[in-house]
Amino acid sequence: LPSCKEDEYPVGSECCPKCGPGFHVRQACGEQTGTVCEPCSPGTYIAHFNGLSKCLQCQMCDPAMGLRTSRNCSTTANALCGCSPGHFCIIQDGDHCAACRAYATSSPGQRVQKGGTESQDTLCQNCPPGTFSSNGTLEECQHGTKCSKWLVTEAGPGTSSFRWV
């Protein structure tokens, strides 16, 4: 077996020049000819110097998995997927994200303690006594108002989700 140089690849008992990123081998070199390289067609790529007969298939980012394309596929690099807005990564695969999930929605009676990021879900916290949050989107719970003195009866005690007026 030949031990080829860094910029060559083995073909039988000979060495041929590699094709550059974005190209694949259309025809191996001969005695009088160099390697014939052909550009990758749309939807395919090769990221390194190579002796490949076909370009590789670009991956596609599946919105159903909460993914969006963070780097488009080019002939020299595969696509990269990130999380769609409002989603965080649930399957981190090295420097790729394989699947994302929508942020949790805080319930009424809770506040958003920490907003979601690409790697972490929204963190919700129950409102402390005497405060309320009617829709769960607030960063701070609101203080309930006391009933006016001319009302004969109080409509009911306040809850962390709703206030009585």
Epitope: K18, L52, K54, Q59, M60
Partner: antibody
């Protein structure tokens, strides 16, 4: 979660045909290339080739040109490996494996399908 | 084709011991990938692009190398690391695997 589930073991006679299935779930089959790998008893892993699941175009390693065929049924999220005119040396476990990343490593593998060829 | 030679073929290590296995390519390759396989199961991605750990792989594993010489190292052997490890290249066709290094617990 992402899974590649292969069809069950096969016992065949020389000259017959076998068709192995690989059903993808948890992702869209056509979003990633699919590879096929052979492991004969007591031997190492041997790459058979791959199929571009978007275009349907197969690529075969030299040792697997002729009697071997990769195909797809995208509506069923399934890739297939068919081996025609079976020979004793085709006795092996066959794996499907998804190509992933910038330099294509195999991130998910099927559980393997054992094919035994014996008269 | 590029032949990948893994050494040693069999390696025995005690818990806590540092382990190194190598993968030598017959011609220069751009990247090396590694898989772990336990008996009766399919291979698992383990290290990709020479040195990046796949999801769920313990930090005691590392990969390095360039050109024709690559290695996988475990800083401190644990019982669950006993398995066969395969290297793989696809710088040129055909894609090839090494014959594997079987790592046993001493």
């Amino acid at each position: 979660q992402i899974q590649l589930v292969q069809s069950g073991p096969e016992l065949k006679k020389p000259g017959e045909t076998v068709k192995i299935s690989c059903k993808a779930s948890g992702y869209i089959l056509t979003n990633y290339g699919m590879n096929w790998v052979k492991q004969a008893p007591g031997k190492g892993l041997k790459w058979m080739g791959w199929i571009n699941t978007y275009t349907g175009e197969p690529t075969y390693a030299d040792a697997f040109k002729g009697r071997f065929a990769f195909s797809l049924e995208t509506s069923a999220s399934t890739a297939y490996l068919q081996i025609n005119n079976l020979k004793n040396e085709d006795t092996a476990t066959y794996f499907c494996a998804r190509g992933y990343g910038n330099h294509w490593y195999f991130d998910y593998w099927g559980q393997g399908t054992s094919v035994t060829v014996s008269s | 084709q590029i032949v990948l030679t893994q050494s040693p073929a069999i390696l025995s290590a005690s818990p806590g011991e540092k382990v190194t296995m190598t993968c030598s390519a017959s011609s220069s390759v751009s990247y090396m990938h590694w898989y772990q396989r336990k008996s009766g199961t399919s291979p698992k991605r383990w290290i990709y692009d020479t040195s990046k750990l796949a999801s769920g792989v313990p930090a005691r594993f590392s990969g390095s190398g360039s050109g024709t010489s690559y290695s996988l190292t475990i800083s401190s052997m644990e019982a669950e690391d006993a398995a066969t490890y395969y290297c793989q290249q696809w710088t040129s066709d055909p894609l090839t695997f090494g014959a594997g290094t079987k790592l046993e617990l001493k």
